[in-house]
């Protein structure tokens, strides 16, 4: 049986059940390399409390559809001698990066995971030439996820004192120059994740090979190497390589750009101080507030919730967007869709799409940016579920009793962007984390 998601095959992936202190290792095409789980385990559960390992999915007992992968085992899941067997179930959804498997829940018999990934899309529009896993768990099982830094088009310019060259990088994947053919990037070779531009020429100085690594609690490392054997004439016979170290700052701060810290014979060392390198619980909440010692800030957007069936309305030329954030009030136009953001076509108001659902909510405060994300909306033709990204700005003099109002700013591949000036986005900072 052919591997259903070949892009995901090259790596053993990890997911965590934080509630029960359990680390899962997942290899969807072969078996995980963990002796204690046996030679054919595709999903290996490592119980960190008891230091034991249990195979909860066998690679030989795999069954697959386009959006679901199941691994059975021969292990009875209760002691009553019934026919039920322990199994793992991975539901795949279209995403814009390789993404990460997320532990959802587990019953006595089934361990459930969900994975938003380019590998599950109906079209190849989000697929990279080369992409590697972009997250890592530290020794405390806290997740550090750089997926939000991945650029689907364009690249980051590295801060460098050399006026004759410009170094451009992407995070965990190659630079897509076709979708955003900026003048400098146009000459970058396909597959490069680190592109050195000198005058009118561009050179591949690194491609992603291995996934993100954690070196210390707040330092993550990504290494790129040039795969082709051909040496570049300005590298003194050395093969180019790029090392990017992502550093979680010791306290809350605005974002910075990646900085070149060392360069020798085409070996480039880059340091990037960014809160995306911090653990995810420091940055994100599933509710509309972020507070407490863990986050170093106090943010509460719940006063923006609308009651009594009213919604915020944002004009998007062809469409009207109805928004009801931080609550579970149905938007009348989007009846029964559980939408937090509802897209209605002006010329045909029967064409209604959920552009993100209220139970699929993430509030994120990172590098000084406050963002509310609603995902899991109605599918687009690519298979990607519509989502909305609301970027908040602090405005102490916002109208509408300080609440302000959302403004639609554009759409890219079924992701809808809004800005929202409001006094409730004014962040109160605490001390250190």
């Amino acid at each position: 049986q052919a591997a259903p998601f070949p892009e995901l095959c090259s790596y053993t992936w990890e997911a965590v059940d934080t509630k029960n202190n359990v680390l899962y290792k997942i290899n969807i095409c072969g078996s995980v390399d963990i002796v204690q789980c046996g030679p054919s385990s595709a999903v290996c559960m490592h119980d960190l409390d008891t230091r034991t390992y249990h195979s909860v999915g066998d690679s030989v007992l795999r069954s697959a559809t386009r959006s679901l992968l199941e691994f059975n085992t021969t292990v009875s899941c209760d002691q009553q001698g019934t026919n039920h067997r322990v199994q793992s179930s991975i539901a795949f959804l279209c995403g814009k990066t390789l993404g990460t498997p997320e532990f959802v829940t587990a019953t006595e018999c089934v361990h459930y995971f969900e994975w938003r990934t380019t590998a599950a899309c109906k079209k190849d529009i989000f697929k990279a030439n080369k992409e590697v896993p972009c997250y890592v768990f530290d020794e405390e099982l806290r997740k550090h996820d750089l997926n939000p830094l991945i650029k689907l088009s364009g690249a980051y310019l590295v801060d460098d004192s050399d006026p004759d060259t410009s170094l451009f990088i992407n995070v965990c994947r190659d630079i897509d120059t076709l979708r955003d053919p900026g003048s400098q990037l146009r000459a970058c070779p396909p597959g490069t994740a680190a592109c050195l531009v000198r005058g009118h020429q561009a050179f591949d100085v690194g491609q992603p090979r291995d996934g993100l690594k954690v070196v210390r609690k707040d330092r993550l490392v990504l290494s790129y190497v040039r795969e082709e054997a051909g040496k570049l004439d300005f590298c003194d016979g050395h093969s180019p390589a790029v090392t990017i170290t992502f550093v979680c700052p010791s306290e809350r701060r605005e974002g910075t750009i990646p900085k070149l810290t060392a360069k020798s014979n085409c070996r480039y060392e880059i340091e990037w101080i960014t809160e995306y390198a911090c653990h995810r619980d420091y940055l994100e909440s599933k509710t509309c507030s972020l507070s407490g010692e863990q986050q170093d800030v106090s943010i509460d957007l719940t006063p923006l919730a609308q009651s009594g069936g009213s919604s915020y309305i944002s004009d998007g030329k062809e469409y009207l967007f109805y928004l009801n954030v931080c609550g579970e009030t149905e938007i009348q136009f989007c009846n029964k869709k559980q939408a937090a953001v509802c897209q209605v076509k002006k010329s045909d108001t029967s064409q209604v799409k959920a552009a993100g659902r209220y139970h699929n909510q993430t509030l994120r405060y990172s590098d000084g940016d406050l963002t509310l994300i609603y995902f899991g909306g109605d599918e687009c033709s690519s298979g990607f579920q519509r989502m909305s990204v609301i970027n908040f700005e602090c405005n102490k003099t916002a109208g509408n009793d300080g609440k302000g109002t959302p403004v639609f700013t554009g759409e890219v591949d079924c992701t809808y962007f809004f800005t929202w000036d409001t006094e409730y986005a004014c962040v109160h900072h605490h001390h250190h984390h």
Partner: nanobody
Framework: QVQLQESGGGLVQPGGSLRLSCAAS????????MDWYRQAPGKQREWVAT???????TYADSVKGRFTISRDNTKNTVYLRMNSLKPEDTAVYYC??????????WGQGTQVTVSS
């Protein structure tokens, strides 16, 4: 005050059965992962069984097929049903509760002796 109290231990003949109970107070019981451990005289404490907050169960190889862990959330109690007991099961049995927001909580233990 957070507490765990084991009961149900005693003297039993080889091949016999016992049911241990562990009653919890002061915690949201259903949110916690529950484990049974045991410590035989002169030996280190060893893990016996786990009942995760979601419901999955795992057992040490030495008790698999003989012991069953279960819980009753209405009574805030976790049980360990022990069948086909052997002399090597003789130990003090402890229950443990754990969750991301709590330090591990241990009970005082209950003695199980398997002897003819």
């Amino acid at each position: 005050q957070v507490q765990l109290q084991e009961s149900g231990g005693g003297l039993v003949q080889p091949g016999g059965s016992l049911r241990l109970s562990c009653a919890a107070s002061g915690i949201i019981f259903s949110d916690n992962r529950m484990d049974w451990y045991r410590q035989a005289p002169g030996k280190q404490r060893e893990w016996v069984a786990t009942l995760a907050s979601y419901g999955w169960k795992t057992y040490a190889d030495s008790v698999k097929g003989r012991f069953t862990i279960s819980r009753d959330n209405t009574k805030n109690t976790v049980y360990l049903r022990m069948n086909s007991l052997k002399p090597e099961d003789t130990a003090v049995y402890y229950c443990k509760a754990s969750s991301p927001v709590l330090n591990d909580i241990w009970g005082q233990g209950t003695q199980v002796t398997v002897s003819s």
